[in-house]
């Protein structure tokens, strides 16, 4: 999906008001210095592409984050403010949610959510030069 035409300011507002808090809750008890940020993004559409991938695509050691509150809210924001955000992707998320039996917070998942926090912070500061 091409995130170019999303309403970035409304997605940013949703992140600041609620998604960010859910990410913090998920990471509670973890030191902010525990994980290095290895995933980066260069502009808002790119950031959303990376956020979508890390949030909804299963990775080794972290089967799926799709059932977490921050993920459901991310999906809702993209569905509302990204025109034509594909039903295929929305339905794929539902399949992932059904496939997941239990919510186990592994160290790999914590690392992944730490990367997500970095991507969201970058999304909120689009004018900053890439390090």
């Amino acid at each position: 999906y091409d995130f170019t035409n999303c309403d970035f300011e409304k997605i940013k507002a949703a992140y600041l008001s609620t998604i960010s808090k859910d990410l913090i809750t998920y990471m509670s008890g973890t030191k902010s210095t525990e994980f290095n940020n290895t995933v980066s993004c260069s502009n808002r559409p790119h950031c959303l592409t990376e956020i979508q991938s890390l949030t909804f695509n299963p990775t080794a050691g972290c089967a799926s984050l799709a059932k977490e509150m921050f993920a459901m809210k991310t999906k809702a924001a993209l569905a509302i403010w990204c025109p034509g955000y594909s039903e295929t992707q929305i339905n794929a998320t539902q399949a992932m949610k059904k496939a997941r039996k239990s919510k186990v917070t592994t160290n790999k998942c914590l690392e992944q959510v730490s990367q997500l926090q970095g991507l969201w912070r970058r999304f909120n500061r689009p004018l900053l030069k890439q390090q």
Epitope: C6, A14, T18, K73, A76, I80, W81, P83, G84, I90
Partner: antibody, heavy 121, light 111 residues
Framework: QEQLVQSGDEVKKPGASVKVSCKSS????????ISWVRQAPGQGLEWMGM????????NYAEKFQGRVTITADPSTTTTSMELSSLRSEDTAVYYC??????????????WGPGTPITVSS | QSAPIQPRSVSGSPGQSVTISCTGT?????????ISWYQQHPGKAPKLMIY???KRPSGVSDRFSGSKSGNTASLTISGLQAEDEADYYC???????????FGGGTQLTIV
């Protein structure tokens, strides 16, 4: 069973405001969006805006921006729509409608019975 | 953005088929597969009949079907019955600002 129950008929003077409520029951309030749609006498349907309880955000049609406010009280699973600076053209039946599940907010699979609002001096 | 165009009225005899068209633009109907159809009897709330172009909610008769070609969506009702007499509205997702646009409505008369 799943239903939306709306508040009763209203008669208002031009310039006044009106608030219509919509009580949800029989389904998980936070999993859906609630939209408001109006229908003037003998006319078609017009989408006004929606509220997504999961995010706590609203989205309004440009035509109604600044004049409509949609709010929710999750504790009572009630959504309200307030329309201000009423004029005679606002005379219509106002419906609340539930956006489809699984984030498919653009179609409406459950409707309230409608609340007639008359604006007359 | 303006409302998609529907014929004001169509008619058919019991047992026949009718098709109601809904013509929009590339910014709404042509741009997304997010088209729904609603049936409304006089004095009643609308009822969802078709969503996402051609999907039927549970409980809706398979006599109702939807399709799309370019900027035009269509609702076909086969084997017309007396209770099908109603107004029919198409609706399309129309981007993040307008979000949903309804067509002007079509009155179906069973003759």
């Amino acid at each position: 069973q799943e239903q939306l129950v709306q508040s009763g008929d209203e008669v208002k003077k031009p310039g006044a405001s009106v608030k219509v409520s919509c009580k949800s029951s029989g389904f998980t309030f936070g999993s859906y969006a609630i939209s408001w749609v109006r229908q003037a006498p003998g006319q078609g349907l017009e989408w006004m805006g929606m509220l997504v309880p999961l995010l706590g955000v609203t989205n309004y049609a440009e035509k109604f921006q600044g004049r409509v406010t949609i709010t929710a009280d999750p504790s009572t699973t009630t959504t309200s729509m307030e329309l201000s600076s009423l004029r005679s053209e606002d005379t219509a039946v106002y419906y609340c409608a539930r956006g489809g599940s699984n984030y498919l907010y653009w179609y409406f699979d459950l409707w309230g019975p409608g609340t007639p609002i008359t604006v007359s001096s | 953005q303006s409302a998609p165009i529907q014929p004001r009225s169509v008619s058919g005899s019991p047992g026949q088929s009718v098709t109601i068209s809904c013509t929009g633009t590339s910014s709404d109907i042509g741009g997304y597969n997010r088209i729904s159809w609603y049936q409304q009897h006089p004095g009643k709330a609308p009822k969802l009949m078709i969503y996402d172009v051609s999907k039927r909610p549970s409980g809706v008769s398979d006599r109702f079907s939807g399709s799309k070609s370019g900027n035009t969506a269509s609702l076909t009702i086969s084997g017309l019955q007396a209770e099908d007499e109603a107004d029919y509205y198409c609706s399309s997702y129309a981007g993040t600002d307008t979000f949903v646009l309804f067509g002007g409505g079509t009155q179906l008369t069973i003759v």
